[in-house]
């Protein structure tokens, strides 16, 4: 049913050379390297790309030449392969080297390091970063996409190219401004912002195919496509839901050239079938390439046509349900889920797919009775608790964001979340409640239509992380149990959660709360990370501490610093002052 | 109001093909189940193939799944029905007719019916 060619080809790396041209060639085969090899410098990198890139104009000038006709998996895995010291730097990630395509791929995927040990990517001064862009401007784009690549190996490679392009862009106006700084700053950090997003958005599509295979993620592209897309039709929405699936499994199969070439011929199909998919494409259609594929992706929904019947119709009242049913399951569960999300676009995709699973089980267990319509018959009403249940998160934790602001709601969420997992690593942990704290600027002042579905799928995505990261060291019986279920279930699973009650205590160690003068001197974001980091400690050490008890704990410490930040000897201040500090903490939460 | 005008129809030796179509005006189509039934004399009008509302679906009687395929262009509002190793049996005036509902197959679920059109195979 998809959009795709697929006619043979002699070559393959020489088809995509051509179809993608070499500059958005070489970007993708670096970002394929840069994430399947975390830890490979820059230039190592950029030498095989050089090599690569070297090899696909041979095969494109003679498509007969000497391994042209090879996999792509082939070429790039033999590469990979012949890096020199690749066990002392990777470990048994060289055992992959062993195995034959397609396992050796598989082996490759399998390494990838959702948290590889590197440090934060730093940005350097803004006349440093001109000077250097201006030097060499396809070196200064290399390195972003090697160094967003290796600290993100699952990110959307296509649209990591976007972002290298609006880098330049910024780089290019900026770079001209008397006042470098006050014009990068802003505009880079907008940048990154929606790249981190993006990365932890494609994370859980990754997360999704590779758990719940090709199915779920067409369950998922299904939901989301309707919403986006009332006015087209259920056999357009499959289309697009099953050209969609095979451009996500490639590049989440580190199939990069195929996913990113695949990309560009779905967006030329939408942009050439607007009149059966939406109204409001033509903007999009009219930008570039990488442009128009970002602009298509998250295009505002289209008007929803005005005579939809009710849902009941078809699916409670029509007495040929369980016929239905029983003569086409997926179908029937598909159009269902079309017909819903295509009235909802004011609900989550995660919602949605809950409410479809809800519709799925009802029929299982009542086309199976001896009056199926009376079983099933109050399904609509079933779903009330489902929907209530989110609703009520994104007013519960909006009106507490209001109120809060930012730094306030994480530290809020952090308590919550070290009190339902204490056994979890607190950097773990900090960063968790960073990130779902963010959901209340990304998201609470978004009309209100609009807020729950930017809640429940950016949470949903946070989480998805929380369980990679868990995942790999295992320590809390309650972020097994909420991350071993489905997708969809997951956010609902960790709302739920209580006090850990079987945890015991972390002792008090002082030297936890014991604070230098060199905190004065750290960004503000540094800061907060520091005393957060003591936040959760706090907790870990009193799991029970009231609301009221912990916030005279921070607005003392806080308290402190500012007083020593402020004093004409810090160090004196840091050293008399923190011991006290300690000791009234300790009788506050005693 | 959904006006349909089939066509296609004609007198064709058994194991022959034939293509239906049927030119619906009025409404949005895709709104529509869009379905075939057949009435040969003396006999009861029987479901044939339907497209299911939206083009989700398409689905067939026992007697025509593997032979006959229906289809629909949204854009020029057509349905159209391909019949392969036409049967003697297969001779009957077919109607095309429009619902409302999901997938239906009985016809007292479709509001809206074409005139007809004859189709003869002859042994």
């Known amino acids: 049913r998809g959009v795709f060619r697929r006619e043979a080809h002699k070559s393959e790396i020489a088809h995509r050379y051509n179809d993608l041209g070499e500059q958005h060639f070489k970007g993708l085969v670096l970002i394929a390297f840069s994430q399947y090899l975390q830890k490979c410098s820059y230039d190592e990198h950029a030498k095989l790309v050089q090599e690569v890139t070297d090899f696909a104009k041979t095969c494109v000038a003679d498509e007969s030449a000497a391994n042209c006709d090879k996999s792509l998996h082939t070429l790039f895995g033999d590469k990979l392969c012949a890096i020199p010291n690749l066990r002392e730097n990777y470990g048994e990630l060289a055992d992959c080297c062993t195995k034959q395509e397609p396992e050796r791929n598989e082996c490759f995927l399998q390494h990838k390091d959702d948290n590889p040990s590197l440090p934060p990517f730093e940005r350097p001064e803004a006349e440093a970063m001109c000077t250097s862009f201006k030097e060499n401007p396809t070196t200064f784009m290399g390195h972003y996409l090697h160094e967003v690549a290796r600290r993100h190996p699952y990110f959307y490679a296509p649209e990591l190219l976007y972002y290298a392009e609006q880098y330049n862009e910024i780089l290019t106006q900026c770079c001209a401004e008397a006042d470098k700084e006050s014009c990068l700053t802003p505009k880079l950090d907008g940048v990154k912002e929606k790249a981190l997003v993006s990365s932890v958005r494609q994370r859980m599509k990754c997360s999704s195919m590779q758990k719940f295979g090709e199915r779920a993620f067409k369950a998922w592209a299904v939901a989301r496509l309707s919403q986006t897309f009332p006015n087209a039709d259920f056999a357009e929405i499959t289309k697009l839901a099953t050209d969609l699936t095979k451009v996500n499994k490639e590049c989440c199969h580190g199939d990069l050239l195929e996913c990113a070439d695949d990309r560009a011929e779905l967006a030329k199909y939408m942009c050439e079938n607007q009149a059966t998919i939406s109204s409001k494409l033509q903007t999009c259609c009219d930008k570039p390439l990488l442009k128009k594929a970002h602009c298509l992706s998250e295009v505002e929904h289209d008007t929803m046509p005005a005579d939809l019947p009710a849902i009941a119709a078809d699916f409670v009242e029509d007495q040929e349900v369980c016929k239905n049913y029983a003569e086409a399951k997926d179908v029937f569960l598909g159009t269902f889920l079309y017909e819903y999300s295509r009235r909802h676009p004011d609900y989550s995709v995660s919602l949605l797919l809950r409410l479809a699973k809800k519709y799925e089980a009802t029929l299982e267990k009542c086309c199976a009775e001896a009056n199926p319509p009376a079983c099933y018959g109050t399904v609509l009403a079933e779903f009330q608790p489902l929907v209530e249940e989110p609703k009520n998160l994104v007013k519960t934790n909006c009106d507490l964001y209001e109120k809060l602001g930012e730094y306030g709601f994480q530290n809020a969420i952090l308590v919550r979340y070290t009190q339902k997992a204490p056994q979890v690593s607190t950097p773990t942990l900090v960063e968790a409640a960073r990130n779902l704290g963010r959901v209340g600027t990304k998201c609470c002042t978004l009309p209100e239509d609009q807020r729950l579905p930017c809640v429940e799928d950016y949470l949903s995505a946070i989480l998805n992380r929380v369980c990679l990261l868990h995942e790999k060291t295992p320590v809390s019986e309650h972020v097994t149990k909420c991350c071993s279920g489905s997708l969809v279930e997951r956010r609902p699973c960790f709302s739920a959660l209580t006090v850990d009650e079987t945890y015991v205590p972390k002792e008090f160690k002082a030297e936890t709360f014991t604070f230098h003068s060199d905190i004065c001197t750290l960004p503000e974001k540094e800061k907060q990370i520091k005393k957060q980091t003591a936040l959760a400690e706090l907790v870990k050490h009193k799991p029970k501490a009231t609301a009221e008890q912990l916030k005279t704990v921070m607005d003392d410490f806080a308290q402190f610093l500012d007083t020593c930040c402020k004093a004409a000897d810090k160090d004196t201040c840091f050293s008399t002052e923190g011991p006290n500090l300690v000791t009234r903490c300790k009788d506050a939460l005693a | 109001q959904v006006q349909l005008v089939e066509s296609g129809g004609k007198l064709v030796q058994a194991g022959g093909s034939l293509r239906l179509s049927c030119a619906a005006s009025?409404?949005?189509?895709?709104?529509?189940?869009m379905g075939w039934f057949r009435q040969a004399p003396g006999k009861e009008r029987e479901f044939v193939a339907g497209?299911?509302?939206?083009?989700?679906?398409?689905y067939y009687s026992d007697s025509v799944k593997g032979r006959f395929t229906i289809s629909r262009d949204n854009a020029k509002n057509t349905v159209y029905l391909q019949m392969n190793s036409l049967k003697p049996e297969d001779t009957a005036v077919y109607y095309c007719?429009?619902?409302?509902?999901?997938?239906?197959?009985?016809?007292?679920?479709?509001?809206?019916w074409g005139q007809g059109t004859q189709v003869t195979v002859s042994s």
């Open positions: 497209s299911g509302r939206s083009n989700s679906y398409n």
């Open positions: 009025g409404r949005t189509f895709s709104n529509y189940a």
């Open positions: 007719a429009a619902s409302t509902n999901l997938w239906p197959r009985d016809r007292n679920l479709y509001a809206y």
